[in-house]
């Protein structure tokens, strides 16, 4: 079995987690992709997913999570904006391929969000603040509700950094809604 590894990000409240999940172009370009959180001893929980079939460079927003699938690059870009302490946890990208079990994209992300001032004088994150200024048009998210029992039967051990994962649920709004937003440059 392939060893599960984690990449750790320590960010401040209000900042943006911005990661990219690499996938095999020929196999998965149009497959539906999802961003999941893994809580200790629980099955992975899907927080957001792309459309089915996944559209190229077409941003989908679910609460504070923005997914953008770049078929020509073979990358799923995931952004979690305006991070909160409760967002701390272990995350992964997966590709849905029913009836087979979801395909996990390496590596998992260990997110640690702490309180405190994130910037330096004059710093800004305009590209993420724009999310809240756009009148959204919403459609229902069609994320599969299942997760294969074989995908994760038990959450992996904590990383060597001894990061704690809070039990509280992630603070997302309108999780069932998809909000389309323009590409951020």
């Amino acid at each position: 079995a392939t060893k599960l590894t984690e990449e750790k990000y320590e960010l401040k409240e209000g900042q943006t987690l911005d990661v990219k999940c690499d996938y095999t172009l020929e196999k998965f370009a149009s497959s539906q992709k999802a961003w999941q959180i893994i809580r200790d001893g629980e099955m992975p929980k899907t927080l957001a997913c792309t459309e089915r079939p996944s559209k190229n460079s077409h941003p989908v927003q679910v609460g504070r999570i923005i997914l953008e699938d770049y078929h020509d690059h073979g990358l799923l870009r995931v952004r979690m904006v305006n991070l909160q302490v409760e967002d701390s946890g272990l995350y992964q990208c997966v590709i849905y391929q029913p009836p087979k079990e979801p395909h996990m994209l390496f590596d998992r992300i260990r997110l640690v969000v702490t309180k405190g001032f994130s910037g330096t004088p004059g710093s800004n994150e305009n590209s993420t603040q724009n999310v809240y200024k756009i009148p959204p048009t919403t459609t229902k998210a069609l994320c599969p509700l299942y997760t294969s029992p074989r995908t994760v039967t038990q959450a992996p051990p904590k990383s060597t950094a001894d990061v704690s994962t809070p039990d509280s649920e992630i603070n997302l709004t309108n999780v069932t809604d998809i909000i389309r937003v323009p590409v951020f440059n």
């Epitope: 392939t2 590894t5 990449e7 990219k20 690499d22 690059h73 990358l75 390496f106 994130s118 800004n124």
Partner: antibody, heavy 119, light 108 residues
């Protein structure tokens, strides 16, 4: 232990060619994007080229586009950089670097190989 | 292309003192910024990524802050082994990934 070992550098005339290799160990090579980063003598770092892991997508700096080709052999755990039509300004130490899975930042570097382009 | 500008070019500090290095991006890169340390004759070493996350094995005296366009690397109490050149790098979008021109931290 993660290790990256570059080879193939040397002295070449302008217009000539070289092929750099980077043999890696200590991680699942096929899963990770890899980049070449160069440093001209006494100068700063310049990203040259990247090849993604799963997708195999390739990218180049404008300064080398059309002249350099990045490739990888996952069965040999080796990354390559084919450099054609070399110019004097390509003279530099060339480093291969392993990237994070989740972003193009470089967590492990080789020791570098020196490419000198001179007549 | 996103241009990264570091200041100062050279910083003269006494051992035990605090060093503050700056990096500015020509446009917002969120927290997608890394810092590297390079000593003469050696390859660069990753210190900080995601603007503030210390890489594995990096001492706690190194800290990063900032977001958007303005970033800072702070070395709280300089040790003899910290005198080196430091580079920032943005990885916000697709290539090219750009580095700052470097800040040399030298002994005062």
């Amino acid at each position: 232990e993660v290790q990256l070992l570059e080879s193939g550098g040397g002295l070449v005339q302008p217009g000539g060619s070289l092929r750099l290799s980077c043999a890696v160990s200590g991680f699942t090579f096929s899963r990770y994007a890899m980049s070449w980063v160069r440093q001209a003598p006494g100068k700063g770092l310049e990203w040259v080229s990247e090849m993604r892991g799963s997708s195999g997508s390739t990218y180049y700096a404008d300064s080398v586009k059309g002249r350099f080709t990045i490739s990888r052999d996952n069965s040999k755990n080796t990354l390559y950089l084919q450099m054609n039509s070399l110019r004097v300004e390509d003279t530099a130490i060339y480093y291969c670097a392993k990237e994070f899975s989740s972003n193009s930042l470089f967590d492990y570097w080789g020791q570098g190989t020196l490419v000198t382009v001179s007549s | 292309e996103i241009v990264m500008t570091q200041s100062p070019a050279t910083l003269s500090v006494s051992p035990g003192e605090r060093a503050t290095l700056s990096c500015r991006a020509s446009q917002s890169v969120n927290a997608n910024l890394a810092w590297y340390q390079q000593k003469p004759g050696q390859a660069p070493r990753l210190l900080i990524y995601g603007a503030s996350t210390r890489a594995t094995g990096i001492p706690a005296r190194f800290s990063g802050s900032g977001s958007g366009t303005e970033f800072t690397l702070t070395i709280s109490s300089l040790q003899s082994e910290d005198f080196a050149v430091y580079y920032c790098q943005q990885f916000y979008n697709f290539p090219p990934y750009t580095f700052g021109q470097g800040t040399k931290v030298e002994i005062k």
